[in-house]
Amino acid sequence: EAGLPRAGGGSQPPFRTFSASDWGLTHLVVHEQTGEVYVGAVNRIYKLSGNLTLLRAHVTGPVEDNEKCYPPPSVQSCPHGLGSTDNVNKLLLLDYAANRLLACGSASQGICQFLRLDDLFKLGEPHHRKEHYLSSVQEAGSMAGVLIAGPPGQGQAKLFVGTPIDGKSEYFPTLSSRRLMANEEDADMFGFVYQDEFVSSQLKIPSDTLSKFPAFDIYYVYSFRSEQFVYYLTLQLDTQLTSPDAAGEHFFTSKIVRLCVDDPKFYSYVEFPIGCEQAGVEYRLVQDAYLSRPGRALAHQLGLAEDEDVLFTVFAQGQKNRVKPPKESALCLFTLRAIKEKIKERIQSCYRGEGKLSLPWLLNKELGCINSPLQIDDDFCGQDFNQPLGGTVTIEGTPLFVDKDDGLTAVAAYDYRGRTVVFAGTRSGRIRKILVDLSNPGGRPALAYESVVAQEGSPILRDLVLSPNHQYLYAMTEKQVTRVPVESCVQYTSCELCLGSRDPHCGWCVLHSICSRRDACERADEPQRFAADLLQCVQL
């Protein structure tokens, strides 16, 4: 079964780890109150303590299944032979209001289980209706969801979920919004939030698109809520660059997709190409993203309020090889303010009757924008026309850091005492620690000040998550979860080494002659007791 926590890391104190030798790990979430860690895997869901001791394991597979069976064999007998089939966890979300974990797998056409947070007891597994089948695609990192809690005391929770469909558009929508009922066995569980003859809370990939481009699909990399919108970062086949000829080379494009949280008819659907560019090199294959607040210094540099959202993203170079992208990659920064402004400008221009809807994969026709006197403000959520809408110009981010050798695979960020720290996972199993400061001398907007090994030689997967107290970072590879301290100040043995490291967490604690965080240093606020600047080392 699963291994015990054990030592890892090099010259630093050993990191706590959790190993799963038998089953590949896929997703990780951390409970923001208890700090407990939930891990999705192939055929398993694990509950771990904050220091990665195993508390519970829940078995989800293998199951007797065949992906050609629709509905699944548990619902209706199937003419296809059944075999022992792995159940890959593809979505793992905490439903705090209902004290449960939502774990969606690949088996039985992609059904979900609700597990009690305390002990992973299975509360329910809706599997009788077509709405219960999200997608049988096995690829773990291709589905993303956002859980929207209902208004306190009333209103229903809902799940926005995006998934690839592997050509089965008659079975699965690529994007949908589903009801989440309090009772796991409720017949309406996972029903579309709205559905009538013409309109519903879903988007299907048209069969025309699949006829022309059989490989067309949308892969959902990251999703988040910001203000009244839900956003997705996606990768999709670029139908403009890819030849319909199946033997031809496939090109991909990254898109940011936006929907209003309270738009059950999906009239607010907008998608824009997204990427960034540095020194003439285009980075267009989104690998991961992380929604954060900027920190006082960065907020000031960007002209933002400290409570505005920013998005850190990792893009690989070019537009080819989605599954094995080029190693060269870039860490980029977007402000949600700029993204919203670009989208609003596009909507306003369309409502002036300018141009087309420009969404070839979804419309298969060049519908013209319709002139309408509507006032389009920041909160506009669409009408039954001028939708769905595609952006024609790429939203470009600010490149912060380029890695030409290792390949960035994952990203997380937080604000430490007004400074913005980004953690980037790499292909070789390392965590790069990066200080973002747009006012850096020499014009370098980010400084990679430390690199630590989480698991040598194994790519860091997307779910890079901070502990609630921001003391640790949980990094996951296919076989291991590693708890990496956000700082290792104690490794620096002199004031010069300590402050020369440029780690924003670290300062020289005079009383004990050690490198530490300010809050770990006695009387740090008294003069000459805590050095936070290299110049102070000389004075001391």
Epitope: D196, E197, F198, K365, E366, D384, F385
Partner: antibody, heavy 120, light 108 residues
């Protein structure tokens, strides 16, 4: 079930006005637009205009601009179409038809039709 | 103003396939819908958004739209399909909904 029930047949003199009602039931009245379409004897279908029951906004066919008025009463889930300055060529069957959107969708439910005869 | 042109009549033998065309300038850049109208009845929507079929409409009804022509196809035509058929689109210049002149389908 979803139903649109229209008012009865009318006979009018040239120059007069006619007001046809269309009462909706079986669905959320404000969630669907309402079109008005007519068919004159031996002729094809002709679109007259559309009303959004949610806010009351209207859009009329150029041909009927200035002569047609569409209104709604949300308390009774009823829409009205009034056509003024009637002429003999306005003799037709008038239909109300609901649609989930203004431009992109079909008219999926139709009233039974109201015959309006304009004759001196 | 925008115009949609349909053939006045189309004849077909039972069990055969009937095709009714509707032509208009760059019609493929608009959504076409089709309505069936029988004497003494109200119109019935049979196809919307070029090729989508409302629930309750038999699978033998299908639609397509490319170039300047939208087509309603009825495969395995039955006697009950005899009716007038109208195509419909929206004129983005005037804001008007436009109907074709109608096609009388006769099942021989």
């Amino acid at each position: 079930q979803v139903q649109l029930v229209q008012s009865g047949a009318e006979v009018k003199k040239p120059g007069a006005s006619v007001k046809v009602s269309c009462k909706a039931s079986g669905y959320t009245f404000t969630s669907y637009y309402m079109h008005w379409v007519r068919q004159a004897p031996g002729q094809g279908l002709e679109w007259m205009g559309i009303i959004n029951p949610s806010g009351g906004s209207t859009s009329y066919a150029q041909k009927f601009q200035g002569r047609v008025t569409m209104t709604r009463d949300t308390s009774t889930s009823t829409v009205y179409m009034e056509l003024s300055s009637l002429r003999s060529e306005d003799t037709a069957v008038y239909y109300c038809a609901r649609a989930p959107g203004h431009y992109y969708y079909g008219m999926d439910v139709w009233g039974q039709g109201t015959t309006v005869t304009v004759s001196s | 103003s925008y115009e949609l042109t349909q053939p006045p009549s189309v004849s077909v033998s039972p069990g055969q396939t009937a095709s009714i065309t509707c032509s208009g300038d760059k019609l493929e850049d608009k959504y076409a819908s089709w309505y069936q109208l029988k004497p003494g009845h109200s119109p019935v929507l049979v196809i919307y958004q070029d090729s989508k079929r409302p629930s309750g409409i038999p699978e033998r009804f299908s639609g397509s739209n490319s170039g300047n022509t939208a087509t309603l196809t009825i495969s395995g035509t039955q006697a009950m399909d005899e009716a007038d058929y109208y195509c419909r689109a929206w004129d983005s210049n005037t804001g008007d909904v436009v109907f074709g002149g109608g096609t009388k389908l006769t099942v021989l």
